[in-house]
Amino acid sequence: GILNLNKMVKQVTGKMPILSYWPYGCHCGLGGRGQPKDATDWCCQTHDCCYDHLKTQGCSIYKDYYRYNFSQGNIHCSDKGSWCEQQLCACDKEVAFCLKRNLDTYQKRLRFYWRPHCRGQTPGC
């Protein structure tokens, strides 16, 4: 769930998600609309798609709590628990490392970006 995601993003990126990513651009944080503003925003849009897919599979994406290990900068999603828990971990791991890969293009001006300015076509999943 959300607690897992926050912890994982902090471990991988070194940034506090609540201060750096939720919200950011047009897709990081709750909801999402329009064209992603940059590579970091694209990470979140892809993550939204990942969650949307799990929702169609009946997974409780905000409630399910999964186990994972973080060591030497890597995330190992546990094969414990239900299918949904395992897949949720995979979605969160992907976004965490995507955000890390794009730290060099992170733009402070996109933090708390005003969502009405998010125009254009929302990318399909």
């Epitope: 009946g58 997974c59 094969d79 414990k80 239900s82 949904c84």
Partner: antibody, heavy 121, light 106 residues
Framework: QVTLKESGPGILQSSQTLSLTCSFS??????????VSWIRQPSGKGLEWLAH???????RYNPSLKSRLTISKNTSRNQVFLKITDVDTADSATYYC?????????????WGQGTLVTVSA | QIVLTQSPAIMSASPGEKVTISCSAS?????MYWYQQKPGSSPKPWIY???NLASGVPARFSGSGSGTSYSLTISSMEAEDAATYYC?????????FGAGTKLELK
């Protein structure tokens, strides 16, 4: 060869605590990825999953019974335990311990013979 | 929790007859697992991840399905197939079983 065997009190009174032991051989609960579940089956009825314990002592419980269940293990003695508090006649059942398959960790490939527990009012 | 509804609850089949046992999930699941149980014995693993036969299961058995609808099929009923069959999911917690389908020999 993997084997599991359950043992229990046989008969106990309502409101007592049920203590079950699963003794196994052919694998070790210190092996990464390994785990054991408890599953019960009232006479003539279906199966109900109760709890699971992993090699690293991570535990999972059926939410409908969580407040009454405690699963634990003794890795060196190859045993897994289940305690059910405040039992009722509805807890009368055959209790199985089971181990998932390595090739499919959501399939219980190995089962004990079961131990019959009767709760009298 | 996901509720698995098996149908029929009881059925009988003649030797050589094709048999289909259904398992319907209250919400979509990724895989279904099946067990065979005979009176006085523990359940045996029968089918895993929807369509894979467990070790020692005769090839006349097959499994299929997706979403909320799954089934176990016996292409040609044999006397030794008389048993109760249970479906199981662990798509989401908690792990749940169906109530079982008792298959009798006609």
């Amino acid at each position: 060869q993997v084997t599991l065997k359950e043992s229990g009190p046989g008969i106990l009174q309502s409101s007592q605590t049920l203590s079950l032991t699963c003794s196994f051989s052919g694998f070790s609960l210190s092996t990464s990825g390994m785990g054991v579940s408890w599953i019960r089956q009232p006479s003539g009825k279906g199966l109900e999953w109760l709890a699971h314990i992993y090699w690293d002592d991570d535990k999972r419980y059926n939410p409908s019974l969580k407040s009454r269940l405690t699963i634990s293990k003794n890795t060196s003695r190859n045993q897994v335990f289940l305690k059910i508090t405040d039992v009722d006649t509805a807890d009368s059942a055959t209790y199985y311990c089971a181990r998932p398959a390595f090739y499919s960790n959501h399939l219980f490939a190995y089962w004990g013979q079961g131990t019959l527990v009767t709760v009298s009012a | 929790q996901i509720v698995l509804t098996q149908s029929p609850a009881i059925m009988s089949a003649s030797p050589g007859e094709k048999v289909t046992i259904s398992c319907s999930a209250s919400s979509s699941v990724s895989y279904m697992y099946w067990y065979q149980q005979k009176p006085g014995s523990s359940p045996k693993p029968w089918i895993y991840r929807t369509s894979n036969l467990a070790s020692g299961v005769p090839a006349r058995f097959s499994g299929s399905g997706s979403g909320t609808s799954y089934s176990l099929t016996i292409s040609s009923m044999e006397a030794e197939d008389a048993a109760t069959y249970y479906c199981q999911q662990y798509h989401s917690s908690p792990l749940t079983f169906g109530a079982g389908t008792k298959l009798e020999l006609k």
